[in-house]
């Protein structure tokens, strides 16, 4: 049954909101989709989770959530926020998850984010952010996940990322980024997942991915690349690579020489005509390889060291004979 404490907790539930104990003598408060235009005033100090998403909140006053020192997750997605003032999250010492997606923010709320030392996950996707100030994440030493997709960024906010050495996953997809400069992610040594799909990327610095020593997933799909992304060669832990739906015409010799852990490569919907014979060597984890319409391939690819392929598709090539060793190379 419920303890006396949970009864006290539930008496601190704002009108029309749904509240329940979180199992740790703290309160989960759901005030989503209620047409609220301002924050509820009578929140329990013991609130650990507060969902205010899908309302009509257009502004936050400084210090709108006083003394919610136990609050770990705050959802403000799907409101009409255009600006978040300094002090909006003052006192939220335990805050780990902050969701601000689907608002109308034009800038990262730098001052409001300062000193959120416990923050692990920050969603800023689906806003109108065109500029990320250099020091905007400088106090977020615990940040693990950052969403900046579906905004109006035209370049990688290189300096802003320098302080995020604990970051593990980031998406910059669905922006208007056109170039990735050398060392764009140079300090993100813990990053495992990076999504850059659906941008306008047409060029990559030769060393643009240097420093991403933990990266396992890289998504460059739906961009304007017209050359193979040789910058991936420093990504020794890369497992999943996507660069489909670009304008890449050739895959060079030794294309994946620095990526021996690759399991999946998606590169369909590119006008690939030429593939270096050694391009797919020494990829022992690779399971599927599909090469459609590569009209300039005249020799069967050398699959030395790529011994675990389960599916190989070659269409539209000019291969006239198969090497005798092909059946030895494949399982």
């Amino acid at each position: 049954g419920s303890s006396p404490r949970s009864g006290v907790l539930l008496r601190g539930c704002p009108t029309h909101c749904h509240c329940e104990p979180d199992g740790r003598m703290l309160l989960r408060v759901d005030c989503s989709d209620l047409g609220l235009s301002e924050l509820p005033s009578n929140l329990s100090v013991f609130t650990s989770y507060l969902d205010l998403s899908m309302n009509n909140i257009s502004q936050l006053l400084p210090n709108p959530l006083p003394s919610l020192r136990f609050l770990e997750e705050l959802r403000l997605a799907g409101n009409a926020l255009t600006y978040i003032p300094k002090g909006a999250f003052t006192g939220l010492y335990s805050l780990k998850v902050l969701m601000l997606q689907n608002n109308q923010l034009r800038h990262v709320p730098t001052e409001a984010l300062q000193n959120l030392r416990s923050l692990q996950s920050l969603r800023l996707d689906a806003n109108h952010i065109s500029y990320v100030p250099p020091s905007c994440f400088s106090g977020l030493h615990s940040l693990r996940h950052l969403w900046l997709d579906d905004n109006a960024l035209t370049e990688i906010p290189v300096q802003a990322f320098r302080s995020l050495s604990a970051l593990q996953a980031m998406t910059l997809a669905l922006n208007k980024i056109h170039h990735i400069p050398d060392y764009a992610f140079g300090n993100l040594s813990s990053l495992v997942v990076l999504h850059l799909h659906n941008n306008r990327i047409h060029s990559l610095g030769k060393k643009c991915f240097d420093g991403l020593h933990s990266l396992e997933t890289l998504d460059l799909n739906y961009n304007n690349l017209d050359e193979f992304p040789t910058a991936i060669r420093t990504l020794s832990n890369l497992k999943e690579l996507g660069f489909h739906s670009n304008n890449i015409r050739s895959i060079p010799e030794k294309a994946f020489v620095g990526n021996p852990s690759l399991i999946t490569i998606h590169f369909y919907d590119n006008p690939i005509q030429f593939v270096g014979r050694s391009a797919f060597q020494h990829l022992p984890e690779l399971r599927t390889l599909t090469l459609n319409g590569a009209s300039q391939i005249t020799e069967f690819p050398d699959l030395t060291g790529t011994a675990n392929l389960e599916s190989l598709t070659l269409t539209g090539a000019q291969i006239s004979s198969l090497p005798q060793t092909v059946c030895n190379q494949l399982p």
Partner: antibody, heavy 118, light 111 residues
């Protein structure tokens, strides 16, 4: 522990070639660029170029483009610098170094003295 | 090529006093807010050792009496309180563009 260990000193005649090796250990060999830098006796440091081990990615200082060649052997985690058509002004200590944080040279080999003398 | 010019060429400082070395690049070495300028220390018979990367970031294991500052074309390496073991030649280096270039070096001695 990251280490770069270079081959021993060489004495060469003008017009000859020299091949200096740099064996890396303690990190993922193919994930970092190796830079080559030289230092003439009593002089400053001069960048020769760089190679990403295992790949064909190289960059040469225009001054050395014709005479310098970088190669690598991933099976032994070794990078090589070959310098041809040696002249007396090539007498120098040749260093390999790892391109670390933002391309800064965070680990260096002990250096290889190449003396060119007739 | 970007020319790196250090000043002074040599510097004599009393133990415990501040030593300041300047480095000027012939053109800006800044890109996307990062200054691609690094500082090295070289003692006789040894390879150079990285002290500071990206103009102001202290390399791991380097004493915090060393600091770097500056942007674009003008940079400074400061040793806040000179120790005997700091006697060496100090070099700045840019890797903003090929060919990467070094300053001519500044020799630091004890007065």
């Amino acid at each position: 522990e990251v280490q770069l260990v270079q081959s021993g000193a060489e004495v060469k005649k003008p017009g000859a070639s020299v091949k200096v090796s740099c064996k890396a250990s303690g990190y993922t060999f193919s994930a970092y660029w190796i830079e080559w830098v030289r230092q003439a006796p009593g002089q400053g440091l001069e960048w020769i170029g760089e190679i990403l081990p295992g790949s064909d990615s190289t960059d040469y200082n225009e001054k050395f483009k014709v005479r310098a060649t970088f190669t690598s052997d991933t099976s032994t985690s070794t990078v090589y610098l070959e310098l041809s058509s040696l002249r007396s002004e090539d007498t120098a200590v040749y260093y390999c170094a790892r391109g670390g944080h933002y391309g800064s040279l965070d680990y260096w080999g002990q250096g290889t003295l190449v003396t060119v003398s007739s | 090529d970007i020319v790196m010019t250090q000043s002074p060429d040599s510097l004599a400082v009393s133990l415990g006093e501040r030593a300041t070395i300047n480095c000027r690049a012939s053109e800006s070495v800044d890109n996307y807010g990062n200054s691609f300028m690094h500082w090295y220390q070289q003692k006789p018979g040894q390879p150079p050792k990285l002290l500071i990367y990206l103009a102001s970031n202290l390399e791991s294991g380097v004493p915090d009496r060393f600091s770097g500052s500056g942007s674009r074309t003008d940079f400074t390496l400061t040793i806040s309180s000179l120790q005997a073991e700091d006697v060496a030649v100090y070099y700045c280096q840019q890797n903003y563009e090929d060919p990467f270039t070094f300053g001519q070096g500044t020799k630091v001695e004890i007065k």
